[in-house]
Interface confidence: low
C-alpha cells in the first residue's frame, strides 16, 4: 500500500490533533531536554509542511520519508552540540543509520528535575487560559521523562488529564475532584510506560521472535476460543505496531494501532465475546479498553494436550517440518488452558519443550525420550507458585513499607554495587507487588505477579545497561528475557563484595525531613537503609531493624522538638555512634 | 450501521426560534461527544456547539454563544440545538456529528447527519 507522499497519507488517516501529538511526542522523546516553546515551533513547521503535501503530494520534498523529514527537522536545532553531546553526531549520517543514532541516544533516566504540582487553582486558570498549550505540555512532560511510552496510549492519558480538568475546574471543591484524578494518572502513567518499556526491550534486546513469543502466550490467554490462525493474525500485527513505537515510527504506529482496533472489533465472533464493549467505545479508549481486555472463559471440551505434543508418534515429523508453527501451537493450546501462569512461566515451559524436543529428536527412540516431557514441567511451575506464596505470606505479614524494607535488603545484598537511587526505586516498585496481586484470588495472583516483577526488573536492566557496574546485573539481564526473574531470585549475598566504607554525611539529617511527605519521608528512610546493607552487608535482619527503629523514633523525636534543627545536630552524631556499635 | 438524522429545520423570521433534533442510531450514543455544525450558502463549514457524553460539559462558538443551547437525552438517543433571537447570518445548512474521540479536544468528526436547512429572513 504505497502513497506518493507518506506524511500526507498518515495527516490524512490520523487527523491534524493526533498528528500534532504524535510529532510532539516524537520530537520530546529523541530531544528530551529542548525546551517546549522550540518543540512546539517544530511540530508546527512538520504540520504546515505535512498539509502542503496534503494538498499536493507532488510538492518538493513530500516523497521523502518520515524518518528523513523528523531527522531533518531535529538536526535544524540550534543548540543541538551544546545540549546533547555526541548525539549531534547523528546528524551527520544517512538514514536508516541517523534514526538508529538518534534512538541509540534516547536516555531512560533524563536528567531532569521532578514534575512539581501547581495548586489547583493554578492550573485550572492555566487550563482555562489556554487549553490546548496546557495539553501539549502534558504530553510533552511525560514523553520527555518517559522516552519509549507508547505513543498512542500517551494521547489517552493526555485526553483523561483533559478530561479531569474540564469536570473539575468547575466542582464546588476543585482540589477534591481534581487530586485523586492526577494521582491516578501519574501511577497509571508510571504502570504504563514500565510495561511499554519492557516490550521495546523484549524487541530491541532479544528481537521479534521473542516478542511474538509473549504475545501468543498473552492473546491466547486473553482469548481462549479464537483459533490459532486468529491469534496468529493478531500476533502478526501487534508485533508491528510495537516495532515501529519502539523504533519511533509513531505516526505508523497509531495508524496500525487504530486498524488493529477496526479489525478486532469487526471480528468479534472469532476472537472474543467479552469485546463488545470496547468496541462501542470511541477510538483512543476502544484501543485502551481492547489492550486491557479481561480474559475470555475457556472452551469447555479443550482435550488433554499429551495426545498432540506427547503421545503421537508424528512430533517430531511436525516439529521437523515447520519449528517455529510447531512450538507457535504448542504455547498457544498451554496458554488457553492456563490462565493462572504467569507468560513468563508460559515461555519457560515453551523453552524446555523445546529443548526436550531438540534433544530427543535426534535419539535413537524419540518417543521414549520425551514421554515424560510433562513431568520436567512440574518444578518449572512450582518455582513461581512458591515464589509467590512466600512473598505474599511476607507482605501479609509485614505490611507495604516493611515488606519493600525487606525487599532493599535482600537485592542490595544481591546486588550492592547498584546505586542507591537505583535499589530503592526498583525495590520500591518490587514490594508494590504486594498491594497489586496478593489480594487476587489463587488464580490469577501467579499472572499478576510475575509478569509485574518482569516489568519492575526491566526497569533495573534498562538503567544498569546505561552504567553497568555488575557482572551479576549484566548475566541475569541479558541472557534469557524469560529467566531473568529466576535469575535475580536465584541471585545471594555477593561473597566479592568490599563493604563501602562508613560515610557519616550519608547518616546526617536535617529539620527539613519534618515537612516531608510520607513517601519523600520513606525514601529518605530507605535510602540510609540501602546505604546501611551496602556498609554492612552481612548484619542481621535483627540488627538491621534494630538501628532502622532507632532511626524512626529519632526523627520523630527531632520532628516534635521547638527547635528541630539543632535537635538533629545534637541527636543525629549519637544516632550514628549507636548505629555503628550496633551494626559493629 | 451508524446514523444521524437531523429534523426541525425551516423558515423563521429574525429574532424567532426553532429547535432541532437529530436523531442517532447503530453505535451507543452516551458514549459519544455531539456536536453542531453549520455551512452558510456559499460558505465553509463552522463548529456551532459541542456537548459531552454525558452531557457534562458544553461548549459553543462565540457567533451564537447566548442564543443557542444544546442538549441531549440519552435514553431516546438525540440531540438537540435550541435557537433562539435567530439572525440573518444564522441561515445555513445545519449538521449534527459525532466526534471520534471522547474528549471533544479534537474536532474532527467521523460521522454526520444528511442537514436540515434553516432559513432566516423577513
Known amino acids: 500500500d504505497t502513497h506518493k507522499s507518506e506524511v500526507a497519507h498518515r495527516f490524512k488517516d490520523l487527523g491534524e490533533e493526533h498528528f500534532k501529538g504524535l510529532v510532539l511526542v516524537a520530537f520530546s522523546q529523541y530531544l528530551q531536554q529542548c525546551p517546549f516553546e522550540e518543540h512546539v515551533k517544530l511540530v508546527n513547521e512538520v504540520t504546515e509542511f505535512a498539509k502542503t503535501c496534503v494538498a499536493d503530494e507532488s510538492a518538493e520534498n513530500c516523497d521523502k520519508s518520515l524518518h528523513t523529514l523528523f531527522g531533518d527537522k531535529l538536526c535544524t536545532v540550534a543548540t543541538l552540540r551544546e545540549t546533547y553531546g555526541e548525539m549531534a553526531d547523528c546528524c551527520a549520517k544517512q538514514e536508516p543509520e541517523r534514526n538508529e543514532c538518534f534512538l541509540q541516544h534516547k536516555d531512560d533516566n533524563p536528567n531532569l528535575p521532578p514534575l512539581v504540582r501547581p495548586e489547583v487553582d493554578v492550573m485550572c486558570t492555566a487550563f482555562h487560559d489556554n487549553e490546548a498549550t496546557f495539553l501539549k505540555k502534558y504530553l510533552y512532560e511525560v514523553a520527555r521523562r518517559h522516552p519509549y511510552f507508547y505513543a498512542p496510549e500517551l494521547l489517552f492519558f493526555a485526553a483523561r488529564y483533559k478530561a479531569a480538568f474540564a469536570e473539575c475546574c468547575q466542582a464546588a471543591d476543585k482540589a477534591a475532584c481534581l487530586l485523586p484524578k492526577l494521582d491516578e494518572l501519574r501511577d497509571e502513567g508510571k504502570a504504563s510506560s514500565a510495561k511499554q518499556r519492557l516490550k521495546c526491550a523484549s524487541l530491541q534486546k532479544f528481537g521479534d521472535r521473542a516478542f511474538k513469543a509473549w504475545a501468543v502466550a498473552r492473546l491466547s490467554q486473553k482469548f481462549p476460543k479464537a483459533e490459532f490462525a486468529e491469534v496468529s493474525k493478531l500476533v502478526t500485527d501487534l508485533t508491528k505496531v510495537h516495532t515501529e513505537c519502539c523504533h519511533g515510527d509513531l505516526l505508523e504506529c497509531a495508524d496500525d494501532r487504530a486498524d488493529l482496533a477496526k479489525y478486532m472489533c469487526e471480528n468479534q465472533d472469532s476472537i472474543s465475546s467479552k469485546l463488545k464493549e470496547c468496541c462501542d467505545k470511541p477510538l483512543l479508549e476502544k484501543s485502551h479498553c481492547l489492550a486491557e481486555v479481561e480474559n475470555d472463559e475457556m472452551p469447555a471440551d479443550l482435550p488433554s494436550l499429551a495426545a498432540d505434543y506427547v503421545e503421537s508418534k508424528d512430533v517430531c515429523k511436525n516439529y521437523a517440518e515447520a519449528k517455529d508453527v510447531f512450538l507457535g501451537m504448542f504455547l498457544y493450546e498451554y496458554a488457553r488452558r492456563h490462565p493462572d501462569y504467569s507468560v513468563m512461566l508460559l515461555l519457560r515451559l515453551a523453552k524446555a519443550y523445546e529443548a526436550t524436543l531438540e534433544k530427543c529428536c535426534a535419539a535413537a527412540d524419540p518417543h521414549e525420550c520425551y514421554a515424560k516431557v510433562f513431568d520436567e514441567f512440574q518444578p518449572l511451575v512450582e518455582e513461581p507458585q512458591n515464589l509467590v506464596k512466600q512473598n505474599c505470606e511476607l507482605f501479609e505479614q509485614l505490611g507495604e513499607y516493611k515488606f519493600q524494607n525487606a525487599l532493599l535488603v535482600r537485592y542490595t545484598k544481591k546486588v550492592p554495587q547498584v546505586s542507591t537511587p537505583t535499589l530503592v526505586e526498583v525495590s520500591r516498585n518490587l514490594g508494590k507487588v504486594g498491594a497489586k496481586c496478593c489480594k487476587l484470588p489463587e488464580a490469577k495472583r501467579m499472572p499478576c505477579a510475575e509478569d509485574y516483577l518482569s516489568v519492575v526488573l526491566n526497569r533495573l536492566c534498562v538503567l544498569h545497561e546505561k552504567t553497568p557496574v555488575s557482572e551479576k546485573v549484566t548475566k541475569c539481564c541479558t541472557e534469557s528475557l524469560v529467566n531473568r526473574r529466576p535469575c535475580f531470585s536465584a541471585l545471594e549475598l555477593d561473597e566479592a563484595y568490599v563493604p563501602k566504607a562508613f560515610n557519616a554525611e550519608t547518616f546526617t539529617f536535617h529539620a527539613d525531613m519534618c515537612t516531608l511527605s510520607e513517601k519523600e519521608k520513606q525514601v529518605k528512610k530507605q535510602t540510609a537503609l540501602v546505604e546501611l546493607v551496602k556498609h554492612k552487608p552481612k548484619a542481621t535482619k535483627e540488627q538491621l531493624k534494630g538501628v532502622m527503629d532507632n532511626f524512626a523514633a529519632f526523627v520523630e523525636k527531632c520532628c516534635k522538638a521547638d527547635d528541630k534543627e539543632a535537635c538533629f545536630a545534637e541527636e543525629g552524631p549519637k544516632f550514628v555512634a549507636a548505629s555503628q556499635a550496633a551494626l559493629a | 450501521e451508524v446514523q444521524l438524522v437531523e429534523s426541525g429545520g425551516g423558515l423563521v423570521k429574525p429574532g424567532g426560534s426553532l429547535r432541532l433534533s437529530c436523531a442517532a442510531s447503530g453505535f451507543t450514543f452516551s458514549n459519544y461527544n455531539m456536536n453542531w455544525v453549520r455551512q452558510a450558502p456559499g460558505k465553509g463549514l463552522e463548529w456551532v456547539s459541542s456537548i459531552s457524553s454525558a452531557g457534562t460539559h458544553i461548549y459553543y462558538a462565540d457567533s451564537v454563544k447566548g442564543r443557542f443551547t444544546i442538549s441531549r437525552d440519552n435514553a431516546k438517543n438525540s440531540l438537540y440545538l435550541q435557537m433562539n433571537s435567530l439572525r440573518a447570518e444564522d441561515t445555513a445548512v445545519y449538521y449534527c456529528?459525532?466526534?471520534?474521540?471522547?474528549?471533544?479536544?479534537?474536532?474532527?468528526?467521523?460521522?454526520w447527519g444528511q442537514g436540515t436547512l434553516v432559513t432566516v429572513s423577513s
Open positions: 456529528a459525532r466526534d471520534p474521540h471522547s474528549t471533544g479536544w479534537y474536532k474532527d468528526f467521523d460521522y
